[in-house]
């Protein structure tokens, strides 16, 4: 628990440089994002294909998306799970990252000092072990998040059935109902392909019990929709009369000294047919 | 035929607290979310929350958090409502329903016939 | 909350007359919906997603509308439409009801 108060953001006087003051495992060990680069990684040919079970929500339920004031959240039923792991994690929510429309790079983790569009995050916890994500989210093992590199490209349909309901999001506080549709639809080609680590929250308060599911594959959304998702928020109430933009809502990469990134593939990229002519 | 049934309405005292039954039949259970709608006399429709029977998740109303709780009991297709601290203002019929998502929207396309709940000393 | 705001709250009209029930959105919605209440029973699903009619209603019965302005139209009022109608949004959170548009025989 922070040591007073809750108010945090990603820019000005509560921005993540003082984060730590209020929730001190922001300065703490293991934390995320990072900065994914060839001289930490690990292949570990014990890092199975993971598998998605109960992803495929019916459009016959209603899911709770939020404007949360840090981003907007989709609330996830406990069983969604992942099977592969050492104990079942149930998913909890998901949410995302993203820049702005002048800087459109707003990714977490980067790749070989990168950053994507915007980022996904599934957020699931040790059902085995806690009763509920909250519960789980200041234990060892208590947390899993899937994360998605989102780059700008074609037009995803997926995607738009969260975008599509922005509108009714758009102040912090505010809530809408989304039809149940299948989340595994949000994920990459080639899930199997993955980066692994233990690290932690990237929002306050930062816990340092989060096993990290990087997709090795990006997801495209496109230009409109990006520019959606950067410009239909604000971190504000409706009636605050100094409404500010949700916008940049992503943790600088964090140091990782010491450490490895455990990979599920082998890096050789394979070449393409023209890179072999 | 798909059928909601409410019971375990009645008269109760202020500050005391209703347990209604909502047990459901003709349709694969698990399958839809239940919701509880109240209807004061004379006066419209309002929302008190759901609970998924899949899983036990429920979200409610903001006006009815902490003194609504919704349950399931999912080997008898039966959806629980207990409220708290019932004051006058809770006396209404306490409708149970089904949405159905159809084409693009839902709607609720089954009621049961309510159960009136009476809050009074 | 998005309030919703039917008028009138009541109306009188004759078998045959052509009547239009109005309901506002306090926000911007996507669809709407209406039920129909008779005394003493549960509502009924009667149009969805702003137009759209729930099997085996008449087809005298239309819906319009959209963003904040919603109407359901009756074009020819017959003796068993006469009873109590609802709009209801699912856009927001609370999903939210009407106040109830009473319509009674002249």
């Known amino acids: 628990a922070p040591v007073n108060g809750s108010k945090w953001t990603y820019f000005g006087p509560d921005g993540e440089n003082s984060w730590s003051k209020k929730y001190p495992s922001c300065g703490g060990l293991l934390q995320s994002p990072i900065d994914l680069h060839s001289d930490i990684l690990q292949y570990d040919a014990s890092l199975t294909p993971l598998e998605f079970q109960g992803y495929n929500l019916s459009a016959n339920k209603q899911f709770l998306l939020t404007n949360n004031g840090h981003s907007v959240k989709l609330n996830l039923p406990s069983d969604m799970h992942i099977q592969g792991l050492q104990s079942r994690y149930s998913a909890t929510q998901l949410h995302l990252h993203w820049g702005n429309p002048n800087d459109p790079h707003g990714s977490e983790h980067t790749v070989s000092g990168q950053h994507f569009a915007a980022e996904l995050h599934i957020v699931h916890y040790n059902s085995d072990l806690y009763p509920d994500a909250s519960t789980a989210s200041n234990k060892s093992e208590g947390l899993a998040v899937l994360a998605v590199l989102i780059e700008m490209g074609s037009f995803n349909p997926s995607y738009d059935k969260i975008f599509s309901h922005l509108q009714h999001v758009k102040y912090k506080g505010q809530e809408a109902f989304v039809p149940g549709f299948n989340i595994e639809e949000l994920l990459p080609e080639r899930t199997a392909e993955y980066y692994r680590y233990r690290g932690s929250l990237t929002t306050p308060p930062c816990n340092p019990t989060v096993l990290w599911t990087v997709f090795r594959n990006p997801v495209q959304i496109s230009q409109e929709q990006l520019l959606a998702l950067e410009t239909a928020l604000y971190c504000t109430h409706m009636d605050d009369p100094s409404p500010r933009e949700m916008i940049n809502n992503f943790r600088q990469v964090q140091k990782f000294d010491e450490r490895l990134v455990y990979t599920s593939f082998s890096q050789v990229q394979v070449c393409t047919a023209a890179g072999l002519s | 035929e798909v059928q909601l049934v409410e019971s375990g309405g009645g008269l109760v005292q202020p500050g005391g607290s209703l347990r209604l039954s909502c047990a459901a039949s003709g349709y694969s259970y698990t399958d839809y979310n239940i919701y509880w709608v109240r209807q004061a006399p004379g006066k419209g429709l309002e929302w008190v929350g759901y609970?998924?029977?899949?899983?036990?998740?429920?979200t409610y109303n903001q006006k009815f958090k902490g003194r609504a709780t919704i349950s399931v009991d999912k080997s008898k297709n039966t959806a629980y409502l207990q409220m708290n601290s019932l004051r006058a203002e809770d006396t209404a019929v306490y409708y149970c329903?089904?949405?159905?998502?159809?084409?693009?929207?839902?709607?609720?396309?089954?009621w049961g016939q309510g159960t009136l709940v009476t809050v009074s000393s | 909350d998005i309030q919703m705001t039917q008028s009138p709250s009541s109306l009188s009209a004759s078998v045959g007359d052509r009547v239009t029930i109005t309901c506002r959105a306090s926000s911007s919605v996507t669809y709407m919906h209406w039920y129909q209440q008779k005394p003493g029973k549960a509502p009924k699903p009667w149009i969805y997603g702003t137009s759209q009619l729930v099997s085996g209603v008449p087809s005298r019965f239309s819906g319009s509308g959209s963003g904040t302005d919603f109407t359901l139209t009756i074009s020819s009022l017959q003796p068993e439409d006469f009873a109590t109608y609802y709009c209801?949004?699912?856009?927001?959170?609370?999903?939210?009801f009407g106040q109830g548009t009473k319509v009674e025989i002249k």
């Open positions: 329903s089904r949405p159905i998502y159809y084409g693009a929207y839902w709607y609720f396309d089954v």
């Open positions: 609970i998924d029977p899949a899983n036990g998740d429920t």
């Open positions: 209801q949004q699912w856009s927001s959170n609370p999903l939210t």
